[in-house]
Interface confidence: low
C-alpha cells in the first residue's frame, strides 16, 4: 500500500522526539518483505529472515532499523544504540544492517519454541518526516529432528587408534557452540573440536566389537539434546581357535591344547571342524603336517572329512585361520591304532600287540585316576595344581601331560567300563591365542566322557 498513513502519537513518541520537537508529524510508508510469508526453523538452529529496503528509499535517508514482534513495542533487534531490546532475544536476534546493499535482514540463532511468532521491520529516521514499515513474516519453530552424524574413516581395527567424528553440519556457525558428549565402553580420548564437530580417538579391543558408541549433542542456547548411537564394527585377528572332532555319529566335548594327540581306530570316519573368532571372519583351511606360508591346503574350508582313517592319515593336521590382521594356526596329532583282525601275525602282530597293550594299560591307569578324582569331588575341577599328571610319550617323542580338569555337564557315574563303552569320543577343542612364531610348551587337558549309545 503506497498511501501515507498516520501513526499513533503514543507509538511514535519515544522514537520521534526530535521530530516532534521540530514540530513535525511522522508519516509511515509501507513496503513488502521479499520472500515467503512464513519461515520454519528447528529448535536450537538458525534462520535468516530476509529483508530488503524499499528501492524508493532515497540515498540520503539515514535512519535506524528495528525488528518488532507483532504486538510488542520493544524491538527484538535494532542497530539503534540508544534503544533497548527484549531480554528474551538479546544476543540471539541480530539486525544485519547494510543500507548501501539495502539489507535489513534479521538473523535468529539458538531458536526457541517461544520465538514462534510474527515479526515486522520498521525503518525510522530522526531527520526525516516519515518512516517505513514492512509487511509481517511468521517464524515457525519446530522440534529438532536432525541428528548428529558419526563418521569412521575406514574400518576400526583392534589395538589401533582411529578418529571418529561426530558432526552436526546443519548447525550454523554463528549459533552458540553445541556441547558434545561421547559414550563408549572402548578406550577413548577426546581430540580436536570445532563448532560443528568433535573428534574422538578410539582404540578398540576385540570385546568392543558390536558394542554401542553414542554421540550426544546439546544445544545450550535452546536447551535441546540430540544423539546418535552406532554399533562398532571392530576388525580383529583371531584370538582363539576351536576344533570340534566327530567320530562316527557321536560327539563328546573336550578341551585340548596345541599339538594334542588323538588316538583313532583304523578305518574309522573322522570329521574335524575348525572354528575361529576374528572380524571379519578368518579364512579357515586345513593342512597335513606343519605348513609353510604358501603351502597348499587339503581343505579350503573349516571342515576336514577323513572318511576312513589309515596310515596315510597318521601324523599332524593343522588348521590355519588366516586374517588380514594376523593368522593363527593350531595342530592336532592323529595316531592310528589298528584293528587286531586287520593285521597279519608274526613280528608285526607282536609289535602292534605290545603297542595296544601299552596303550590300554595307560588308558586304564588314566581312567582309574579320573574315577578316583571324581569320587573325591563331584564339582568340576577348576584349579589343577594339585593333580598329578600322567606322563605319556607322544607320537613324535614329545611328552604330553594328561590332566583331569574339564568335565562334561553330566559326568558319568563311576563304575566299570563295559565293552560297548570303551571307545572314547572327542570334540570342541578351544585353542587360546598363541603368539605367532613363539611356540609354547602347553599342557593338554583331557577328561573322560561316557557316550550312551
Amino acid at each position: 500500500m503506497q498511501g501515507a498513513q498516520e501513526a499513533s502519537a503514543s507509538e511514535m513518541l519515544p522514537l520521534l522526539l526530535p521530530l516532534l520537537w521540530a514540530g513535525a508529524l511522522a508519516q509511515e510508508r509501507r513496503f513488502q518483505l521479499e520472500g515467503p510469508e512464513s519461515l520454519t526453523v528447528q529448535e536450537g538452529l538458525c534462520v535468516l529472515v530476509p529483508c530488503r529496503l524499499p528501492t524508493t528509499l532515497p540515498a540520503s535517508y539515514y535512519g535506524y532499523g528495528y525488528w518488532f514482534l507483532e504486538g510488542a513495542d520493544v524491538p527484538v533487534a535494532t542497530n539503534d544504540p540508544d534503544e533497548e531490546v527484549q531480554e528474551e532475544t538479546r544476543g540471539r536476534f541480530h539486525l544485519l544492517w547494510d543500507p548501501r546493499r539495502k539489507n535489513c535482514s534479521l538473523s535468529i540463532r539458538d531458536a526457541r519454541r517461544r520465538d514462534n511468532a510474527a515479526y515486522f521491520f520498521r525503518l525510522k529516521s530522526k531527520w526525516m518526516k516519515y518512516g517505513y514499515t514492512s509487511s509481517k513474516l511468521s517464524v515457525r519453530v519446530m522440534a529438532l529432528t536432525h541428528r548428529p552424524n558419526i563418521s569412521i574413516p575406514g574400518t576400526l581395527e583392534s589395538g589401533h587408534p582411529s578418529n571418529l567424528t561426530c558432526s552436526v553440519p546443519w548447525v550454523c556457525e554463528q549459533g552458540t557452540p553445541p556441547i558434545f558428549s561421547w559414550m563408549s565402553a572402548a578406550p577413548t580420548s577426546l581430540g580436536p573440536r570445532t563448532t560443528q564437530s568433535s573428534v574422538l580417538t578410539i582404540t578398540p579391543r576385540p570385546q568392543d566389537h558390536s558394542t554401542n558408541l553414542t554421540c550426544q549433542v546439546t544445544f545450550p542456547g535452546a536447551g535441546v539434546t540430540m544423539e546418535r548411537t552406532i554399533q562398532l564394527n571392530v576388525s580383529y585377528a583371531p584370538q582363539k581357535v576351536a576344533i570340534s572332532i566327530f567320530q562316527g555319529n557321536s560327539a563328546a566335548f573336550k578341551i585340548l591344547q596345541n599339538t594334542s594327540s588323538l588316538p583313532v581306530l583304523e578305518g574309522q570316519a573322522l570329521r574335524l571342524l575348525c572354528d575361529a573368532d576374528g572380524n571379519p571372519p578368518a579364512h579357515l583351511s586345513w593342512f597335513q603336517g606343519f605348513p609353510a606360508l604358501n603351502a597348499t591346503p587339503i581343505s579350503n574350508t573349516g571342515v576336514l572329512e577323513l572318511p576312513q582313517v589309515g596310515s596315510a592319515e597318521e601324523g599332524d593336521f593343522t588348521c590355519r585361520a588366516q586374517h588380514p590382521l594376523g593368522s593363527l594356526q593350531i595342530s592336532l596329532s592323529l595316531f592310528v591304532h589298528w584293528k587286531p583282525e586287520g593285521r597279519a601275525g608274526g613280528v608285526l602282530g607282536a609289535v602292534w600287540g605290545a603297542s595296544i597293550t601299552t596303550l590300554v594299560f595307560l588308558c586304564v591307569c588314566f581312567i582309574f585316576r579320573v574315577k578316583t578324582r571324581r569320587k573325591k569331588a563331584a564339582q568340576p575341577v577348576q584349579n589343577t595344581d594339585d593333580v598329578n599328571p600322567v606322563m605319556v610319550s607322544g607320537s613324535r617323542g614329545h611328552q604330553h601331560q594328561f590332566q583331569t580338569g574339564i568335565v562334561s555337564d553330566h559326568p558319568a557315574e563311576a563304575g566299570p567300563i563295559s565293552e560297548d563303552e570303551q571307545e572314547l569320543h572327542y570334540a570342541v577343542l578351544h585353542f587360546h591365542k598363541v603368539q605367532p612364531q613363539e611356540p609354547k610348551v602347553t599342557d593338554t587337558e583331557y577328561s573322560e566322557i561316557k557316550i550312551h549309545k
Epitope: 563418521s151 574413516p153 575406514g154 574400518t155 581395527e157 589401533h160 587408534p161 582411529s162 578418529n163 564394527n233 576388525s235 571379519p280 588380514p324 590382521l325
Partner: antibody, heavy 117, light 108 residues
Framework: QVQLKESGPGLVAPSQSLSITCTVS????????VSWVRKPPGKGLEWLGV???????SYHSTLISRLNISRDNSKSQVFLKLNSLQTDDTATYYC???????????WGQGTLVTVSA | QIVVTQSPAIMSASLGERVTMTCTAS???????LHWYQQKPGSSPKLWIY???ILASGVPARFSGSGSGTSYSLTVSSMEAEDAATYYC?????????FGGGSKLEIR
C-alpha cells in the same frame, strides 16, 4: 573369501562416458566401503573416490564434476561413471575394499580402459 | 590436498643388500593412516605395510616401515629376488587420499 571383480568396456571414444561395474563377494557393501583407484600406463596409482558403507560418497577434488559412484546392495555391485573422457583417462581401473585404518585390503584384478578415437 | 613424494623413483640392489625408500608428505599425516602397497607388473597392488609399520599378512619379516609426521620410510633388510616390484606409499589422512609416485626396486 573376499573377492572383487571389475568389468569395463575396454575401449571408449574421447568425450564419451565410462561405466565400470565392480562385483564383490565375501563381504557386505553395507559394512565396508569400496574405493576406485586407477593406474595410467607408466604412472602411479591415483585414488578416484569412495562409496562408504552408509552409501555416502567422497570424490577426488579434480574429478568431482565428472565422477559418480553408486551401488546396488542387493546385487553386491558398485558402479563407477566417469564423464567427458580424455586420452589421459586411459588407465587400469581397480576397485578395492575399504580395510583397516583406511587401507585397501582387497583389490580387484583391474580392467584396462583405453580412451581413443 | 596432501602431495606424497617418493624417492628414489628407481633403485637397484644386489641380493642380500639393505634397501631403504622414503615417502614425504606435503603436510603432516597420522602414522595410523600411512600405508605401503607392492605392485608387480600385470598384477593388482597388494597391501604390504599398514599404519606405518605393521606388516600385512604374508609379508616377509625382512620388510619394515617407520616414520612420523611428514617423513616415512620402507626398508628391506636383505634384498631377495621376489622383492623386485614397485612400492607405493599412500596417505588416508585427508581426502583426497593420495599415493606417492612409486619407488621401483630392481635387482642389480
Amino acid at each position: 573369501q573376499v573377492q572383487l571383480k571389475e568389468s569395463g568396456p575396454g575401449l571408449v571414444a574421447p568425450s564419451q562416458s565410462l561405466s565400470i561395474t565392480c562385483t564383490v563377494s565375501g563381504f557386505s557393501l553395507t559394512s565396508y566401503g569400496v574405493s576406485w583407484v586407477r593406474k595410467p600406463p607408466g604412472k602411479g596409482l591415483e585414488w578416484l573416490g569412495v562409496i562408504w558403507h552408509d552409501g555416502s560418497t567422497s570424490y577426488h577434488s579434480t574429478l568431482i564434476s565428472r565422477l559418480n559412484i553408486s551401488r546396488d546392495n542387493s546385487k553386491s555391485q558398485v558402479f563407477l561413471k566417469l564423464n567427458s573422457l580424455q586420452t589421459d583417462d586411459t588407465a587400469t581401473y581397480y576397485c578395492a575394499s575399504d580395510g583397516y585404518s583406511g587401507t585397501f585390503a582387497y583389490w580387484g584384478q583391474g580392467t584396462l580402459v583405453t580412451v581413443s578415437a | 590436498q596432501i602431495v606424497v613424494t617418493q624417492s628414489p623413483a628407481i633403485m637397484s640392489a644386489s641380493l642380500g643388500e639393505r634397501v631403504t625408500m622414503t615417502c614425504t608428505a606435503s603436510s603432516s599425516v597420522s602414522s595410523s593412516y600411512l600405508h605401503w602397497y607392492q605392485q608387480k607388473p600385470g598384477s593388482s597392488p597388494k597391501l604390504w605395510i599398514y599404519s606405518t609399520s605393521i606388516l600385512a599378512s604374508g609379508v616377509p619379516a625382512r620388510f619394515s616401515g617407520s616414520g612420523s609426521g611428514t617423513s616415512y620410510s620402507l626398508t628391506v633388510s636383505s634384498m631377495e629376488a621376489e622383492d623386485a616390484a614397485t612400492y607405493y606409499c599412500h596417505q588416508y589422512h585427508r581426502s583426497p587420499y593420495t599415493f606417492g609416485g612409486g619407488s621401483k626396486l630392481e635387482i642389480r
